[in-house]
Amino acid sequence: AVNGTSQFTCFYNSRANISCVWSQDGALQDTSCQVHAWPDRRRWNQTCELLPVSQASWACNLILGAPDSQKLTTVDIVTLRVLCREGVRWRVMAIQDFKPFENLRLMAPISLQVVHVETHRCNISWEISQASHYFERHLEFEARTLSPGHTWEEAPLLTLKQKQEWICLETLTPDTQYEFQVRVKPLQGEFTTWSPWSQPLAFRTKPAALGKDT
């Protein structure tokens, strides 16, 4: 279980969850491993069991408290270890001093809704979920619209460089079905990454008005 290439990556959702992924080529699927969290200035220790998500990849969530509680700050350091059972003992496979606000990945935006739709444009709003108040307005968003006959990968990215929880999509085709997604990222943190994409919101533009006979 030791010889394969291994990777240990964790992200903090900015509130009360640290999600970790451990991958190792050549490791046995039934290997028992866990993540142990040891903070430098908190009274708690936490452990989560790594569960298989693919052939050589395991994941778990360190749940630190109620979803919207602020369990860590910018000054916290949490030492994270991957421990795997080898016979009767646990072996440290990976270790890092984790700075939560250097390793952020927020929850996907929620509550997407169509505010107003016309023939060529559509106004959509959303909300961010479980995001720390520390960010104030220091967030950015990316959005994409799925057009008929295209894939999500082909959809151009629209960037919102500020905390703007709405968008007005323009130059749309009348009477056409679209889907829309958005994701969020704090500006803070060297290893911070984009949230997952939101659940797609389906909408249809209004038909063009029929021309009147003269």
Partner: nanobody, 126 residues
């Protein structure tokens, strides 16, 4: 760009002590695990010790365990190696090395190093 500059090497008698320093620049020092490696004359690179970003985790090669201590001062962007009870077989060029992330993998300590310094010579001889 990343720069790692070692200092503190020299000639020391067996049983003596020496302290090495590594001044780091060009990256956020505390965000990365660091290590010391060495190369004896005519030999390959050998891992000596590793330390996590805030020094809460350390690990040593069996050959130096109990004699060497790795530490860091993130305010000064400096990595240290205190070497006690030195032996002739500790003679080598000592390099400070940066890992490519905050994570260090004890079973494979050579993995993930992306930069190392020019080295400082340590000679243990009577």
């Amino acid at each position: 760009q990343v720069q790692l500059v070692e200092s503190g090497g020299g000639l020391v008698q067996p049983g003596g002590s020496l302290g090495l320093s590594c001044a780091a620049s060009g990256f956020t020092f505390s965000n990365y695990a660091m290590s010391w490696v060495r190369q004896a004359p005519g030999k390959g690179l050998e891992w000596v010790a590793s330390i996590t970003g805030f020094g809460r985790g350390t690990d040593y090669a069996d050959s130096v365990k109990g004699r060497f201590t790795v530490s860091r001062d993130n305010a000064k962007n400096t990595l240290y190696l205190q070497m006690n009870s030195l032996k002739p077989e500790d003679t080598a060029v000592y390099y400070c090395a940066k890992y490519s992330s905050s994570t260090y993998y004890p079973p494979t300590p050579a993995r993930g190093r992306d930069y190392r310094g020019q080295g400082t010579q340590v000679t243990v001889s009577s």
